[in-house]
């Protein structure tokens, strides 16, 4: 059951896993959701009947039955985490907190002209987790406006004081702000011989990878694959650190995988969702339960559905036995990983998917595409919306991309002599123009917020955010795609589609059912030798075939330029303008969207 | 409501310089998106677009006129100036400024006439 | 420059009856999903007023029986049925790129 409210002056007593220090109830259960094992948390707030020494501790709770006995107690304020909740979850933790010291390893100190730029150096440095910064009214004038970078094994403060005339906060590297590079790379036959701060098991270099991300002090790690010669080390994953935050040596070895967190990139690839199967293979841990299940499918389906798995292992059934139905161990540990992992036993071992919900939507596996053929199948694009205007009739306007629940991203320049939302409609999971009648649903458009710097379309800042009025299911046929990263700047996409119902060639008439092209990038060097009336910046991107023949054309401004990279769909442009339609060494410019995530996040978080 | 006014010195000689202003009303150039162009029409003849400024103080002129236009604003007193060099008879137009925002010229002025007679 | 052409020059319409006016650019005022095109009306001693804008969307206060259709290059302005009051000159107009430019004009009279 989800529990969302917080119970003031209330104690859950016992169960205690471990101690960390909150600047708010709030964030404890964040902490706690986070956590491996933490299903309930009391966290005591700043009261002159507690011991200052108890201020802003969270305590982490387990339960066999998943509450604990409440005890009347002030200044406490006890939850639950939200792994018991279905809804998206985030660490992205904005807030300021004034008059707080938030302690830790203070690993660097310069002056900073206000809290916001502290903000932004700690989440720009690898190894910040939070920040204290003194303001200009701190009493000690050579204090005054020093910026305090920290980090700690936990990533959260080892104490929190009150502190007049300073504010604390944490790095924005998991709101997706962080200009860090994003290397996806994993590196084969390769060992990182740098300090350890961690081991787990995992199955595989790719679930290692994830675990690294979500460690707070993990910067990249070293993988032995079963494989490995040492058998005592095969499907170790070692987390690792250095202090210039990269590998300091590189050692070339057989059967080992190497590569790096990728807390940078983590709201466009899946950092915590394991879906995997891995076959012939059995994970160890605590047995939480047994339980029959015809598949390994249905066998995680019940792990993901007991709060209290974090992973299992599934052995088929032996010929006709228990109805075909096989055994399913429910386990779980310490930190969330098996303590060993067996091959060669016939088990089908996975995790627990309860985690996805900490990973972005957009990342979800869509269904395979259809190769070939320039109409769509429905449900191969899930994001692409139709806009409508209802001003003189109905029709279709522009296109669009679903990019949160509430959020549509579209140009700017189509609202030429738009002045009201209330004439646009949305359509989402739509194929065919001609399935929208009069009775069919649409969402209203709350507000148009168009980038302040538009003036048209060939200037760039040709952008545009939908706020929706009522919030957007997701299914197979309406979901978001991923924002590209700001650490993917410089990602070569090579499996880009672009998408929409617009003129298949100049003079045509929409089209009823959505089309699709397969279309290259094209570099901004070569665009701008294309289109030397114009200046084609870096906040421009440009695709299309030299030899014309394929390309966005009329009906298609705002719709998506959609890469896929690493099997996640990423948004890399909007469909902003062109000459002509497909024409010979005329490629069509999209607004670089990477370039505008900071400006699509700001308006998107606004409180 | 928007309104526009221009006023100008309404007969000028030959090689002088042109001064407009157009005061204005109901929106502000202030306004992320706004802006105010100049447009002529010699009598009985079509429109000819002069000279457009943005909120950011952007400008933009038409091209073969370039070298005699300088379009300007004063902000906090919502006007819009346009200043045309070495005028002769061809010049002789009404002047509109018109408000344009991210969409087509909305408001008009009622224009004023200028003549350059020697 | 985006030179824009209109015709006919002038065009004498029965009350009731249908007028069109076509405006042809030097080039496609689109933009893969607006077509950049304005029609304006002006009548005399009056600034020209917004008729459509975007090639078919009515602007403030305008009559339904104007309407406005066309893309890339070919545009027209139809007016039906005519009413004496719209005996006045027509103007298309692009916005697509700098220098906007308008069309020479199409005086309207009633028959």
């Known amino acids: 059951e989800c529990v969302t409210q917080l119970l003031k002056d209330t104690c859950f007593e016992g169960g205690d896993i471990t101690t960390v220090f909150t600047p708010s109830a709030k964030y404890c259960q964040v902490v706690c959701t986070y956590h491996p094992r933490c299903l309930l948390f009391t966290f005591t707030a700043e009261s002159p009947s507690e011991d200052p020494t108890r201020w802003f501790t969270c305590v982490l709770k387990d339960s066999v039955t998943e509450t604990l006995p409440r005890v009347n107690r002030t200044a406490a304020i006890s939850g639950y985490s939200f792994k018991q909740c279905s809804h998206q979850i985030s660490a992205c933790n904005k807030d300021i907190y004034v008059d707080l010291d938030m302690k830790g390893i203070n690993y660097n100190s310069s002056v900073a002209k206000s809290a916001q730029e502290c903000q932004e150096r700690c989440t720009d440095d690898v190894h910040c987790h939070f920040f204290t910064y003194a303001t200009r009214q701190f009493p000690s004038l050579e204090h005054r406006n020093i910026c305090l970078l920290k980090h700690t094994q936990t990533g959260t403060p080892t104490r929190i004081t009150k502190l007049d005339k300073v504010v604390s906060g944490f790095s924005l590297k998991s709101c997706a702000l962080s200009n860090l590079a994003c290397i996806r790379d994993i590196f084969p036959n390769t060992v990182f011989a740098d300090s350890n701060i961690d081991s787990v098991m995992a199955p595989d270099a790719f679930v290692c990878g994830r675990i690294c991300t979500h460690h707070p002090g993990c910067l990249f790690f070293t993988f032995f694959s079963q494989e490995w010669p040492k058998e005592s080390q095969r499907n170790l994953c070692l987390l690792k650190t250095s202090e210039s935050g990269l590998p300091s040596t590189r050692i070339k070895k057989s059967k080992a995988l190497s590569g790096f967190s990728l807390q940078s990139c983590r709201h466009s690839i899946p950092v915590f969702c394991h879906s995997s199967f891995y076959h012939d293979t059995d994970f160890l841990g605590e047995e939480l339960d047994i339980v029959a299940a015809k598949s390994h499918e249905a066998c995680q389906k019940l792990c993901t559905n007991a709060v209290r798995c974090q992973f299992f292992t599934y052995t088929p059934a032996q010929a006709s036995c228990n109805e075909g139905k096989g055994k399913c161990y429910l386990k779980l540990s310490s930190n969330g990983s098996p303590t060993k992992i067996l091959h060669g036993r016939g088990g089908i071992s996975g995790y627990t998917l309860r985690l996805c919900k900490m990973d972005n939507e957009c990342t979800t596996k869509i269904k395979p595409r259809i190769v070939g053929g320039t109409a769509s199948v429905r449900g191969e694009w899930p994001w692409q919306v139709t806009l409508h205007t209802t001003s003189p009739t109905q029709r279709h306007l522009c296109g669009g991309s679903i990019i949160g629940n509430q959020w549509i991203l579209t140009a700017a320049h189509c609202f030429y002599g738009v002045e009201s939302p209330k004439i646009l409609r949305v359509y989402s999971g739509i194929l065919n123009q001609s399935e929208i009648k009069e009775d069919t649903s649409f969402f209203g458009v709350q507000e148009i917020i168009i980038h302040d710097q538009y003036k048209m379309a060939e200037s760039g800042y040709d952008i545009a955010l939908l706020k929706l009025e009522t919030t957007v299911n997701y299914t197979d046929s309406q979901r978001p795609i991923c924002l590209p990263s700001k650490g993917d700047r410089n990602v070569i996409y090579t499996d880009c589609w672009v998408t929409g119902w617009g003129y298949r060639k100049l003079r045509d008439k929409i089209q009823n059912t959505l089309q699709k092209a397969k279309i290259p990038l094209v570099t901004n060097e070569e665009c701008q030798k294309r289109y030397r009336g114009h200046k084609i910046t870096h906040k421009m991107i440009c695709a299309g075939y030299r030899e014309g023949g394929k390309d966005a054309c009329k009906g298609d401004s705002g719709g998506p330029l959609s890469c896929k990279h690493n099997e996640v769909w990423h948004l890399v442009g909007i469909t902003s303008w062109g000459e002509g339609c497909a024409q010979r060494e005329r490629p069509g410019v999209y607004t670089n969207v990477v370039e505008y995530v900071d400006w699509i996040l700001e308006k998107t978080q606004a409180v | 409501q928007v309104t526009l006014k221009e006023s100008g010195p309404g007969i000028l000689q030959p090689s002088q310089t042109l001064s407009l202003t157009c005061s204005f009303s109901?929106?502000?150039?202030?306004?992320?998106?706004?802006?105010v162009s100049w447009i002529r029409q010699p009598s009985g003849k079509g429109l000819e677009w002069l000279a457009h400024?943005?909120?950011?103080?952007?400008?933009r002129y038409k091209p073969s006129l370039k070298s005699r236009l300088t379009i300007s604003k004063d902000t906090s007193r919502n006007q819009v100036f346009l200043m045309i060099t070495s005028v002769d008879t061809a010049d002789t137009a009404t002047y509109y400024c018109?408000?344009?925002?991210?969409?087509?010229?909305?408001?008009w002025g009622q224009g004023t006439l200028v003549t350059v007679s020697a | 420059d985006i030179v824009l052409t209109q015709s006919p020059a002038s065009l004498a319409v029965s009350l009731g009856q249908r007028a069109t006016i076509s405006c042809r650019a030097s080039?496609?005022?689109?933009?893969?999903?607006?077509?950049?095109l304005n029609w304006f009306q002006q009548k005399p001693g009056q600034p020209p007023k917004l008729l459509i804008y975007?090639?078919?969307n009515l602007g403030s206060g305008v009559p339904a029986r104007f309407s406005g259709s066309g893309s890339g290059t070919d545009f027209s302005l139809n007016i039906h049925p005519m009413e004496e009051d719209d005996t006045a000159m027509y103007f298309c107009?692009?916005?697509?790129?700098?220098?906007?430019?308008f069309g020479g004009g199409t005086k309207l009279e009633m028959k």
């Open positions: 080039e496609s005022v689109d933009n893969y999903g607006i077509s950049f």
């Open positions: 975007a090639a078919s």
């Open positions: 018109v408000r344009k925002g991210r969409g087509p010229f909305a408001n």
């Open positions: 109901g929106f502000s150039l202030n306004t992320s998106g706004m802006g």
């Open positions: 400024i943005y909120w950011d103080d952007d400008k």
């Open positions: 107009q692009q916005d697509k790129g700098v220098p906007w430019t």
